[in-house]
């Protein structure tokens, strides 16, 4: 039975040209995290594997940095980076937990961070 919950940074906004940290945290489960995949829509951004470490997908190498923790840092943001991001936790024995973050990249300097929320 899947008892865990994923807490994410929720709906966030950032300035064009700036950077942002995408963070997810899995709690309320003793399941072992074997791998975390970060995806943007259906595109693989990065992988963090318990045995093999971090992998940033080739097309994102210039603008994506691993961490902090199991999170992901997006740099040199463009308006095209606006959209949904998913952290997919592959755990044993629970299975797969998915967290969703919506990022809006703004032209102006009035970007604010949204509230944190939970996805069961």
């Amino acid at each position: 039975m899947m008892t865990g919950t994923i807490e994410t940074t929720g709906n966030i906004s950032a300035e064009k040209g700036g950077s942002i940290i995408l963070q997810c945290h899995l709690s309320s489960t003793t399941a072992q995290v074997t791998q975390v995949n970060w995806e943007q829509q259906d595109q693989l951004l990065a992988i963090c594997n318990a045995d093999l470490g971090w992998h940033i997908s080739p097309s994102f190498k210039d603008r994506v940095a691993p961490g902090p923790g199991l999170g992901l840092t997006l740099q040199s943001l463009t308006v095209n980076d606006t959209g949904e991001y998913f952290c997919i936790y592959h755990t044993y024995p629970d299975g797969t937990y998915t967290g969703r973050i919506f990022l809006e990249v703004l032209e102006s300097s009035v970007a604010e961070h949204g509230a944190r929320f939970q996805i069961p």
Partner: antibody
């Protein structure tokens, strides 16, 4: 079409060397962990070695440790297995295989294999 | 000697249900996923089951996988003559830091 094509097998004397290649096509090679698996005549499958996405982490079966070296050239979409100090018991069909995007899920694509015969 | 233990052979008649077992230890099957492969004579292995119980697209639902403790099993229902092949289980071993295979089970359709 997703494909793996091994080459480089052949007849070699005990103590000799051989380098196997595996050409990948139809997928983003950099995004996948790769392995070599072998099968001696009339025997079962034996995992040989694994390499992570950029080649900075490798694992080997005890039977080949110190003699075999796995490597990859992502710019050429090619996986390699350098085999030194070959023994009669290394005689086998060698398969290269792609790991599922979630490493621990298994090997989802296999090549057709290349035959290595170690004999005097 | 394989780290994972499988029966050497199994058999059944067409239409029957056959189960192949795979036994491991606490550092592999108990805490990791199991995958199963089918190898038809003279061909490369093909992934049948991943994540202990899931089927890749294209694999018939006659094939199913399950896991309990340090053991896993592959079940084939509605056995067909084309199922005659060798079947292998595998898992990542946390202690050995390596992929470990079962010795393989030769399935004969009588």
């Amino acid at each position: 079409e997703v494909q793996l094509l091994e080459s480089g097998g052949g007849l070699v004397q005990p103590g000799g060397s051989l380098r196997l290649s595996c050409a990948a096509s139809g997928f983003t090679f950099d995004d996948y962990v790769m392995s070599w698996v072998r099968q001696a005549p009339g025997k079962g499958l034996e995992w040989v070695s694994l390499i992570n996405w950029n080649g900075d982490k490798t694992y080997y079966a005890d039977s080949v440790k110190g003699r075999f070296t796995i490597s990859r050239d992502n710019s050429k979409n090619t996986l390699y297995l350098q085999m030194n100090s070959l023994r009669a018991e290394d005689t086998a069909v060698y398969y290269c295989a792609r790991h599922w995007i979630v490493l621990q899920y298994g090997l989802d694509v296999w090549g057709q294999g290349t035959t290595v015969t170690v004999s005097s | 000697q394989s780290v994972l233990t499988q029966p050497l052979s199994a058999s059944g008649t067409p239409g029957q249900r056959v189960t192949i077992s795979c036994s491991g230890v606490s550092s592999n099957i108990e805490i990791k996923y199991v995958s199963w492969y089918q190898q038809l004579p003279g061909t490369a292995p093909k992934l049948l089951i991943y994540n202990s119980h899931q089927r890749p697209s294209g694999v018939p639902d006659r094939f199913s996988g399950s896991k309990s403790g340090t053991s896993a099993s592959l079940a084939i229902s509605g056995l067909q003559s084309e199922d005659e092949a060798d079947y292998y289980c595998t898992s990542w071993d946390d202690r050995l830091k390596s992929w470990v295979f079962g010795g393989g089970t030769k399935l004969t359709v009588l």
